[in-house]
């Protein structure tokens, strides 16, 4: 009886794993083996495919073959018993184009209200992604084990920290890689779960802000308790994108080591031009907090984005606010050559209830005020460019009294 050629050959490539699967054409014939040949583009001769000769199953692995992953190849298969079937040719393909990104490796660390996720490619030193290793981005799905409500986080790098979680709670997540340059989305990792720790005695510092004063940077933060010491560290932001690096060598800011106030001042020349991450930690001598949320600090923008200056014209039921360019030391106005949006906060002097106005214009009306009442106003500028999502610190508050009634015109 003539042997029929195998049919429906599928090529699965995940990272550097090359797997072939096919269907037997004739299930009734026993003890059949299968063999593959391959042919590179521009070659006439066929070469035996190592790892895929005289196979008794319907699956074989040819990962050991050192192929140029960007070069098109052709495969053919036949069945063998006493005689052989005719060859069945598989459509030619380019391994790189066909390849899928495998599940990444995931490593989790827990804090009380945060989880640190370290992600690395599933295949170390992959040949398939050798030219693209630095271009991997990752996305993840995270959920509370008890609720199952999923949250997606896109475009993260090899280390990511998720904040604002609950203590003593199990969170589960899965991660997949993407190569946006090649329009490739990977396979999800297995699900990893970790339980956050008991709540730490000391919370981390919050609301870290950087401003510029004269030739110095001023770093301020909020803290719950008094009589603490703080340390501040920095890291080049680009290091977060380095997939092979899981040792982030955070460095101390010398003038911000063991400071006893919730701010520290250090010279601008501590940092060369660039984008940095900053973090703050608190200690009371016995206990240490976890690190604060990391803030991004761009020396270029920080140097320019100063708080706005403004004048107030007071009426009985409103303020007219005129925003001008901020002043540098020496009272020269700063030229801001990118669009800004202004956030104006105002409140009655005797109350803590703040109201907010966001405005693109430089003349702003604050309406619905009471006559003969002292109101305070502070303002800050934000860049409108999403990529440079920066904010100045707030200006000092300016307090003015509204006029008596009937002066609104």
């Amino acid at each position: 009886k003539n042997l029929k050629s195998p049919q429906k050959v599928e090529v699965d490539i995940i990272d550097d794993n090359f797997i072939l699967r096919w269907n037997r054409s004739d299930e009734s014939v026993g003890n059949v083996t299968f063999s593959f040949d391959y042919q590179k583009t521009g070659m006439d001769n066929w070469i035996k495919l190592s790892g895929c000769q005289n196979i008794t199953s319907t699956k074989c692995n040819f990962s050991s073959l050192k192929l140029n992953v960007y070069e098109e190849i052709k495969l053919r298969i036949r069945a063998e018993k006493e005689n052989t079937s005719s060859w069945y040719e598989v459509d030619s393909f380019t391994p790189f184009r066909k390849a899928q990104i495998g599940p990444p490796e995931v490593h989790l660390e827990a804090e009380d209200k945060a989880i640190v996720i370290h992600i690395s490619p599933g295949t170390k030193d992959s040949v398939m992604w050798a030219l693209d290793g630095l271009s991997f981005t990752y996305s993840l799905v995270i959920w509370k084990n008890s609720s199952g409500v999923e949250e997606r986080i896109e475009n993260i790098y090899s280390r990511h920290k998720i904040y604002k979680l609950s203590p003593e709670t199990t969170y589960c997540l899965k991660v997949k890689a993407a190569l946006l340059t090649s329009w490739k989305i990977g396979v999800y990792s297995p699900v990893h779960c970790i339980k956050t720790t008991v709540e730490n005695e000391l919370p981390p510092p919050e609301n870290i802000e950087v401003s510029v004063q004269n030739q110095n940077y001023v770093l301020k933060w909020d803290y719950t308790y008094a009589n603490m010491t703080f340390q501040v560290q920095w890291l080049h932001a680009f290091l977060k994108r380095n997939p092979g690096n899981h040792l982030y060598k955070w460095k101390q800011i010398p003038d911000c080591e063991n400071v006893k106030t919730t701010q520290c001042v250090f010279p601008q020349n501590v940092f060369q031009k660039g984008i940095y991450l900053l973090r703050v930690q608190a200690s009371d001598g016995n206990n240490t907090s976890f690190w604060s949320e990391e803030i991004k600090f761009d020396t270029e923008i920080q140097a320019f984005l100063l708080p706005p200056v403004f004048n107030i014209r007071s009426l009985s039921d409103s303020f007219h606010i005129y925003i001008g360019a901020p002043k540098q030391s020496g009272n020269t106005p700063v030229i801001q050559d990118y669009p800004l949006i202004y956030e104006i906060i105002f409140w009655e002097n005797t109350s803590n209830a703040e109201r907010k106005i966001i405005e693109k214009k430089t003349d702003v009306t604050v309406p619905n005020l009471k006559p003969l009442t002292v109101y305070c106003v502070k303002a800050r500028a934000h860049t409108m460019d999403e990529k440079l999502n920066k904010s100045s610190v707030f200006s000092d508050a300016v307090c003015e009294k509204t006029k008596p009634g009937n002066t609104s015109k």
Partner: antibody, heavy 118, light 107 residues
Framework: QVQLVQSGAEVKKPGASVKLSCKAS????????IHWVKQAPGQGLEWIGR????????KYAPKFQGRVTMTADTSISTAYMELSRLRSDDTVVYYC???????????WGQGTLVTVSS | DIQMTQSPSSLSASVGDRVTITCKTS??????VAWFQQKPGKAPKSLIY???YRYSGVPSRFSGSGSGTDFTLTISSLQPEDFATYYC?????????FGPGTKVDIK
């Protein structure tokens, strides 16, 4: 493969200094921290400090501050620890270890025995 | 400094026994805890990092668990080569510290 090879045993007099070396191979020393740990005979492990060989930034345990100096020569993949004003209780084995992010101290040197005796 | 205590300080066990060693830290260290094994006259050997991850080449009978201030090393079925001293280690904040050790010997 990854290896940390430490210098040989030393005998020193009280008050003297000793400089120990830890030669790394199989990895780039600049990508890691090198830690030093001491162990007295029959006792536990005690952390002395660490160096970042890339920029020579150090952290020392307060107990050793002022008496220990850690340095590194990346051109020969070697970290050093110098301990001054030696006392008889410095008669211990000193270990160097490689530290890499969440992997912590993953590889150790074989140890160097320092004997302080008059 | 973060203090670390280990219990028991020593234990006698037989081959095949399940052995559990606990480690307590004086403050919350997240999951920044590692475990080492040391045999007399030898350098420490790294077993576990980040509380529960085994280093490559470490047998699966070794496992770690815990978080915050309470950590555990478990040897599911003690083998003859496991008789040694075990140390926990925190690398959450400087100065890094070690537990005093737990000596596991043959019953």
């Amino acid at each position: 493969q990854v290896q940390l090879v430490q210098s040989g045993a030393e005998v020193k007099k009280p008050g003297a200094s000793v400089k120990l070396s830890c030669k790394a191979s199989g990895f780039n020393i600049k990508d890691y921290y090198i830690h030093w740990v001491k162990q007295a005979p029959g006792q536990g492990l005690e952390w002395i400090g660490r160096i970042d060989p890339e920029d020579a930034e150090t952290k020392y345990a307060p107990k050793f501050q002022g008496r220990v100096t850690m340095t590194a020569d990346t051109s020969i993949s070697t970290a050093y620890m110098e301990l001054s004003r030696l006392r008889s209780d410095d008669t211990v084995v000193y270990y160097c270890g490689r530290y890499h992010g969440y992997w912590a101290l993953d590889y150790w040197g074989q140890g160097t025995l320092v004997t302080v005796s008059s | 400094d973060i203090q670390m205590t280990q219990s028991p300080s020593s234990l006698s066990a037989s081959v095949g026994d399940r052995v559990t060693i606990t480690c307590k830290t004086s403050q919350n260290v997240g999951t920044n805890v590692a475990w080492f094994q040391q045999k007399p006259g030898k350098a420490p050997k790294s077993l576990i990092y980040s509380t529960s991850y085994r280093y490559s080449g470490v047998p699966s009978r070794f496992s770690g668990s815990g978080s915050g201030t309470d950590f555990t090393l478990t040897i599911s079925s003690l083998q003859p080569e496991d008789f040694a001293t075990y140390y926990c280690h925190q690398y959450f904040s400087y100065p890094y510290t070690f537990g005093p050790g737990t000596k596991v010997d043959i019953k």
